[in-house]
Interface confidence: medium
């Protein structure tokens, strides 16, 4: 049994880091493998992660972490029974993938303005709480070409757009994702999408 693709890990910078790797053949990850991880710090204890299958030869492990600070460094040991298959380390702050925003809501009752709001996925005491920026994706269910991205570079988790920038009388969907420049993170996954029917009063034409 050998590791074909070494584990790569990303952290949500809150409580979970996710590590993925590939074996050289079909593997029952949860019965055959264990990923041990230990914070390199005073009296920190080793923890064991039981991996799950992620495709035939792929494995994924969700490492639970009490808290994360930028200095944290973890040792990682991948075991198959008594055999050490791979040894490495992981610094969560250098591999951050933020949590996806939640509770995306479209408020359509604000005088021909669409107000999109969502929730910041982090609690206020987390470093990323005040460092997230967002991308909002809006698309038409009827017209695949009607697809747009709005970059929200301020901290408030909301976006206002004129309803008239979208077509009237058709249904749209929106979703939002986040990233943090301070840690050069990857983008989060998209939030679940939300749907609304776009309708607004056309202004009377003046002759």
């Amino acid at each position: 049994m050998k590791v074909l693709q070494e584990p790569t890990c990303v952290s949500d910078y809150m409580s979970i880091s996710t590590c993925e790797w590939k074996m050289n053949g079909p593997t029952n990850c949860s019965t055959e493998l264990r990923l041990l991880y230990q914070l390199v710090f005073l009296l920190s204890e080793a923890h064991t992660c039981i991996p799950e299958n992620n495709g035939g030869a792929g494995c994924v492990c969700h490492l639970l972490m009490d808290d994360v600070v930028s200095a944290d460094n973890y040792t990682l040991d991948l075991w198959a029974g008594q055999q050490l298959l791979w040894k490495g380390s992981f610094k969560p702050s250098e591999h951050v993938k933020p949590r996806a925003p939640g509770n995306l809501t479209v408020h359509t009752n604000v005088s021909d303005t669409l107000l999109l709001t969502w929730s910041n996925p982090y609690p206020p005491d987390n470093y990323l709480y005040n460092h997230l920026t967002y991308a909002v994706n809006i698309w038409s269910e009827n017209d695949p070409a009607d697809f747009r991205i709005y970059n929200v570079t301020y901290l408030e988790p909301s976006l206002r757009i004129a309803a008239s920038t979208l077509k009237s009388g058709i249904s749209y969907r929106a979703r939002v994702r986040a990233w943090a420049q301070c840690y050069n993170t990857t983008w989060s996954e998209w939030s679940p999408s939300t749907k609304w029917h776009n309708s607004y009063r056309e202004p009377f034409e003046q002759h």
């Epitope: 710090f41 005073l42 920190s44 600070v69 200095a71």
Partner: antibody, heavy 123, light 107 residues
């Protein structure tokens, strides 16, 4: 009343051994990480040993590694420091200190200290 | 190892004055710093943790500030019971290290 009382200090010959004890009272001893901090005659403070709440994991810096062993007996609410191969630079006032329960894994500050016990290493 | 440089080594002041003690870390320790007070013949007492949070029962005339490599402890309107020695401690990496101390004496 939260209290830590050290004992076992004294005068010891170079290369000799000594065992310090710290009796804890007024709090749930078994919930806390504990440590020994020493203060030299020049008034410098140094962490010399630490132990987790169940005694399964210990730490000591390179200056005392292999010579000092920290242990605990949660049934007796007592912390110990076994010192061997003592050197003149080990002469100090030894404090038993409780690590605060607040914060995350890096929050290693000490919220309760004993009065200390003096160890003098003579040639 | 991270070195903690405390200044001044000693300081004379009068009751009612305001004094500031500083601690410099040899590398970034974020806010992982505590301040202790030690009176003559007594054990150290925790004053401030995480650079600026006052420990329980500590009077509000004490305040901690700073992050990264530069930290300070300020004592407003010195009281007779404030004289003694003050130490900083970083708890960011191992080994944890204390500053050499600042002795605050009555002028």
């Amino acid at each position: 009343d939260v209290k830590l009382v050290e004992s076992g200090g004294g005068l010891v010959k170079l290369g000799g051994s000594l065992k310090l004890s710290c009796a804890a009272s007024g709090f749930t001893f078994s919930s806390y990480y504990m440590s020994w901090v020493r203060q030299t005659p020049e008034k410098r403070l140094e962490l010399v040993a630490a132990i987790n709440s169940n005694g399964g994991s210990t730490y000591s810096p390179d200056t005392v590694k292999g010579r000092f062993t920290i242990s605990r007996d949660n049934a007796k609410n007592t912390l110990y420091l076994q010192m061997s191969s003592l050197k003149s630079e080990d002469t100090a006032l030894y404090y038993c200190a409780r690590r605060s329960l607040l914060g995350n894994h890096r929050d290693w500050y000490f919220d309760v200290w004993g009065a200390g016990t003096t160890v003098t290493v003579s040639s | 190892d991270i070195q903690m440089t405390q200044s001044p080594a000693s300081l004379s002041a009068s009751v009612g004055e305001t004094v500031t003690i500083t601690c410099r870390a040899s590398e970034n320790i974020y806010s992982y710093l505590a301040w202790y007070q030690q009176k003559q013949g007594k054990s150290p007492q925790l004053l401030v943790y995480n650079a600026k949070t006052l420990a329980d029962g500590v009077p509000s005339r004490f305040s901690g500030s700073g992050s990264g490599t530069q930290f300070s402890l300020k004592i407003n309107t010195l009281q007779p019971e404030d004289f003694g020695s003050y130490y900083c401690l970083h708890h960011y990496g191992t080994p944890l290290t204390f500053g050499a101390g600042t002795k605050l004496e009555l002028k």
